[in-house]
């Protein structure tokens, strides 16, 4: 009788890992092996298939085999008996292509209100995603375990942290690699779950914010508690997406080490031209806080977002407000290359209530005022470019008298 | 693989100093932490700092600081220690550790024991 | 500084025996707690890493859990090498510190 060749032969790439499969043409015939020859591209002659030669179940292993995953390779594959059956050739493909990408391996550390993830690709060192190592980027899923309200996060590297969790509560994750400059997106990994800590004594300080002032940068923060003492560190952003490498090596700024306020000063020459991530943490001798929320902060828009100078011109029912270039140190105004935004908040100088006006224009009415009262305005510029994404600080409050009654015209 | 390769025994004076060196190999040290612990004689152990061979820059335990100094040399991938105004309380060995991923120790130096006595 | 206290300072098991010994932190550390053990005349060895982490190559028999203040590490059925100290250490701030140490003999 003779042999049937194998049909729907599949070939799955996860990784560095070549699997093959197949089906039995035959069922009724025992004792049969299978063998697969392949053939590069612009080659006649067919090689035997290291790992698939003489298999009796319908699946094998070819990941031996060193392939230029970006070659196209064809196979084909036989039955053998006694006799052999005709070659069955399975299309063509190129390994870059038909791969997928492997759940990744996860490692979680957890905080009381935080949880860190660190992420590496799932195969170390792996040969088809060789060139691409930096690109990957992961999205995760979270939920707490008591709930199942799933939460996605989207574009993260290899160490993420989530911020903003409740204290002794477990919550489960898996995470997923992509690889959009090829349209790849891998499978998740196995669920991983982490109980957050009991609540710390210390809360991390919060509402970091980044200025410039002459040729200094001043990082400030809020801090619940009086008698403290401060740390500020920094890393370079692009070490978060470095794969593999989970240890960070956080560096000091001298200026800010054991500050006594919820401020530090320093030259702003102390940072190259880059984007950095800060973080500050609080001690008052005996416990420790765990690190803030972690800011990013660059320098080429920090140089330039200054706070908005303006002008008050003071009516009786409305303040008219002429916003100008900043000025740097030597009272030179600053170019600004990019569109802004300007966010103005004014108040009754015996009151909190605050109002906000944001408005394109540089000359902007505010209206509804009292004669003769105090305001007081404050504003800060946005940049409307949704990639940079960039606030100043608030400038310095102005405050004004309205003038009397029907001044207004 | 991975190795470290510490100096040999030391017997010191009271008040003079001890440098120990750790040589490294299978790694690029820049690319981590090299921590120095050490242990007295049946007691546990104590984490006296760490250098970035990268930049060198170091963390010293309040307890040593003003009297250990670590420093390193990336040419022959070796780091050092030196304690100075030695006492017979430092008499100890006298380990060196890689700080690897997550911050921990993952491989660690045969150790060096540095008596001191007058 | 972050004290660390490790319990029992002593411990006799036999073989098969499971064991815990619990490390107890003076502050909040997360998950930043490592185990080592060491035997006499030899370097400390990495056993356990971010509280619950296994060391590849260290055997399932070693497991690590809690986090904030408590943690510990067990050993579910004691083999006879496993006889020796050993050491928590916290790894979330500097100084980083040790526990006192565990030794576990033979009964």
């Known amino acids: 009788k003779n042999l049937k060749s194998p049909q729907k032969v599949e070939v799955d790439i996860i990784d560095d890992n070549f699997i093959l499969r197949w089906n039995r043409s035959d069922e009724s015939v025992g004792n049969v092996t299978f063998s697969f020859d392949y053939q590069k591209t612009g080659m006649d002659n067919w090689i035997k298939l290291s790992g698939c030669q003489n298999i009796t179940s319908t699946k094998c292993n070819f990941s031996s085999l060193k392939l230029n995953v970006y070659e196209e390779i064809k196979l084909r594959i036989r039955a053998e008996k006694e006799n052999t059956s005709s070659w069955y050739e399975v299309d063509s493909f190129t390994p870059f292509r038909k791969a997928q990408i492997g759940p990744p391996e996860v490692h979680l550390e957890a905080e009381d209100k935080a949880i860190v993830i660190h992420i590496s690709p799932g195969t170390k060192d792996s040969v088809m995603w060789a060139l691409d190592g930096l690109s990957f980027t992961y999205s995760l899923v979270i939920w707490k375990n008591s709930s199942g309200v799933e939460e996605r996060i989207e574009n993260i590297y290899s160490r993420h942290k989530i911020y903003k969790l409740s204290p002794e509560t477990t919550y489960c994750l898996k995470v997923k690699a992509a690889l959009l400059t090829s349209w790849k997106i891998g499978v998740y990994s196995p669920v991983h779950c982490i109980k957050t800590t009991v609540e710390n004594e210390l809360p991390p300080p919060e509402n970091i914010e980044v200025s410039v002032q002459n040729q200094n940068y001043v990082l400030k923060w809020d801090y619940t508690y009086a008698n403290m003492t401060f740390q500020v560190q920094w890393l370079h952003a692009f070490l978060k997406r470095n794969p593999g490498n989970h240890l960070y090596k956080w560096k000091q700024i001298p200026d800010c080490e054991n500050v006594k306020t919820t401020q530090c000063v320093f030259p702003q020459n102390v940072f190259q031209k880059g984007i950095y991530l800060l973080r500050v943490q609080a001690s008052d001798g005996n416990n420790t806080s765990f690190w803030s929320e972690e800011i990013k902060f660059d320098t080429e828009i920090q140089a330039f977002l200054l706070p908005p100078v303006f002008n008050i011109r003071s009516l009786s029912d409305s303040f008219h407000i002429y916003i100008g270039a900043p000025k740097q140190s030597g009272n030179t105004p600053v170019i600004q290359d990019y569109p802004l935004i300007y966010e103005i908040i004014f108040w009754e100088n015996t009151s909190n209530a605050e109002r906000k006006i944001i408005e394109k224009k540089t000359d902007v009415t505010v209206p509804n005022l009292k004669p003769l009262t105090v305001y007081c305005v404050k504003a800060r510029a946005h940049t409307m470019d949704e990639k940079l994404n960039k606030s100043s600080v608030f400038s310095d409050a102005v405050c004004e008298k309205t003038k009397p009654g029907n001044t207004s015209k | 693989q991975v190795q470290l390769v510490q100096s040999g025994a030391e017997v010191k004076k009271p008040g003079a100093s001890v440098k120990v060196s750790c040589k490294a190999s299978g790694f690029n040290i820049k690319d981590y932490y090299m921590h120095w612990v050490r242990q007295a004689p049946g007691q546990g152990l104590e984490w006296m700092g760490r250098i970035d061979p990268e930049d060198a820059e170091t963390k010293y335990a309040p307890k040593f600081q003003g009297r250990v100094t670590m420093t390193r040399d990336t040419s022959t991938s070796t780091v050092y220690m030196e304690l100075s105004s030695l006492r017979s309380e430092d008499t100890a060995v006298y380990y060196c550790?890689?700080?690897?991923?997550?911050?921990?120790?993952?491989?660690w130096g045969q150790g060096t024991l540095v008596t001191v006595s007058s | 500084d972050i004290q660390l206290t490790q319990s029992p300072s002593f411990l006799s098991a036999s073989v098969g025996d499971r064991v815990t010994i619990t490390c107890k932190a003076s502050q909040n550390v997360g998950t930043n707690v490592v185990w080592y053990q060491q035997k006499p005349g030899k370097a400390p060895k990495l056993l356990i890493y971010?509280?619950?982490y296994r060391v590849s190559g260290v055997p399932s028999r070693f497991s690590g859990s809690g986090s904030g203040t408590e943690f510990t590490l067990t050993i579910s059925s004691l083999q006879p090498e496993d006889f020796a100290t050993y050491y928590c250490?916290?790894?979330?701030?500097?100084?980083?510190?040790f526990g006192q140490g565990t030794k576990l003999e033979i009964k």
């Open positions: 971010s509280a619950s």
């Open positions: 550790a890689r700080g690897g991923n997550f911050y921990v120790m993952d491989y």
């Open positions: 250490q916290q790894k979330n701030n500097y100084p980083y510190t």
